[in-house]
């Protein structure tokens, strides 16, 4: 999907309100500095692209952060600002369903949630503070 | 761990040329801009050239421009420098560092690889 | 092009604070980084976007910058901070990345 016609100020809006908060949730008694960055991005299409990747596609090792509620509310957000979004993560999510279930946070997960942090902290500064 | 590994170095004699690698490991290499940077024996840092995170587009400094070439291939995690017509002054340590990017902003080199040392002589 | 000028050397006590400058044309409106280099290895950064510092590196390196002057601070000086310290930035007028010349920081 191409994220480049999404109206980023109200993902970011529903970022800070509420995404940002289960994520911090999420991290609870992590400090985000137990973690080096190992993903970035570059825009905001980028970064959302990013942020998609990294909180929708299982990795081995952390296969179940999209039923988290920061992802429902992340994949809300995106159905809702970006157009045709929702169309093209209908075999996703019927993919998603067929999965076990499995509530465990794993540390590697927490790594990964570090990471969404941090690309979502780089998609809500609209640009550098100079240069 | 995050690791920046350069190889491809040795001794070359003046005006042949030699290709760098820099394998990277434990980052999303397709998202960070990656950069060369030499250092002559005794002297500073000096910035050579940078490729964008999605290999779009290039800079180099005026040092090496028309000689030297830095392409990525995100698909084997590997940054490359193919260097032509070497002369003596480009003889030299040279790294591999990452550095996130914001637009056509790149900022800080926040890892860096060990080294790999050229030496151009006759 | 874009100029960074460093001092070639820097002398503290150990204990003491050591001072490290970067001059350069209106720097102040750039962001300047900060890297250490010890004999035989790659360089470290110790600084970024100016006054940010990665999670490795010690709370006693600090940095500032305004006006045409970056300054890198280094409290309670120890032998191991001896190294030689670069600034750098990424000029956008030309889109090359400049260094400073660096400073040699010795610990008395």
């Known amino acids: 999907y191409d994220f480049t016609n999404c109206d980023f100020q109200k993902i970011e809006a529903d970022y800070l309100r509420t995404i940002s908060k289960d994520l911090i949730t999420y991290m609870s008694g992590t400090k985000s500095t137990d973690f080096n960055n190992t993903v970035s991005c570059s825009n905001r299409p980028h970064c959302l692209t990013e942020i998609q990747s990294l909180t929708f596609n299982p990795t081995p090792r952390c296969a179940s952060l999209a039923k988290e509620m920061f992802a429902r509310k992340t994949k809300a957000t995106l159905a809702l600002w970006c157009p045709g979004y929702s169309e093209t993560q209908i075999n996703a999510t019927q993919a998603m369903k067929k999965r076990r279930k499995r509530k465990v946070t794993t540390n590697k997960c927490l790594e990964q949630v570090s990471q969404l942090l941090g690309l979502w902290r780089r998609f809500i500064r609209t640009l550098l503070k100079k240069q | 761990q995050m690791q920046l590994v350069e190889s491809g170095g040795g001794v070359v004699q003046p005006g042949r040329s030699l290709r760098l690698s820099c394998a990277a490991s434990?980052?999303?290499?397709?998202?960070?801009?990656m950069h060369w940077v030499r250092q002559a024996p005794g002297k500073g840092l000096e910035w050579v050239a940078v490729v964008w995170y999605d290999g779009y587009d290039t800079h180099y400094a005026d040092s090496v421009k028309g000689r030297f070439t830095i392409t990525r291939d995100n698909s084997k995690n590997t940054l490359n420098l193919q260097m032509n017509s070497l002369r003596a002054e480009d003889t030299a340590v040279y790294y591999c560092?990452?550095?996130?990017?914001?637009?056509?902003?790149?900022?800080?080199?926040?890892?860096w690889g060990q080294g790999t040392m050229v030496t151009v002589s006759s | 092009s874009y100029v960074l000028t460093q001092p070639p050397s820097v002398s503290v006590a150990p204990g003491q604070t050591a001072r490290i400058t970067c001059g350069g044309n209106n720097l102040g409106s750039k962001s300047v980084h900060w890297y250490q280099q010890k004999p035989g290895q790659a360089p470290v950064l110790v600084v970024y976007d100016d006054s940010d510092r990665p999670s490795w590196i010690p709370e006693r390196f600090s940095g500032s910058n305004s006006g045409n002057t970056a300054t890198l601070t280094i409290s309670r000086g120890e032998a191991g901070d001896e190294a030689d310290y670069y600034c750098q930035v990424w000029d956008m007028s030309s889109d090359l990345v400049v260094f400073g010349g660096g400073t040699k920081l010795t610990v008395l």
């Open positions: 560092s990452r550095s996130p990017q914001w637009e056509d902003i790149f900022e800080s080199m926040d890892i």
């Open positions: 434990g980052f999303t290499f397709r998202t960070y801009g």
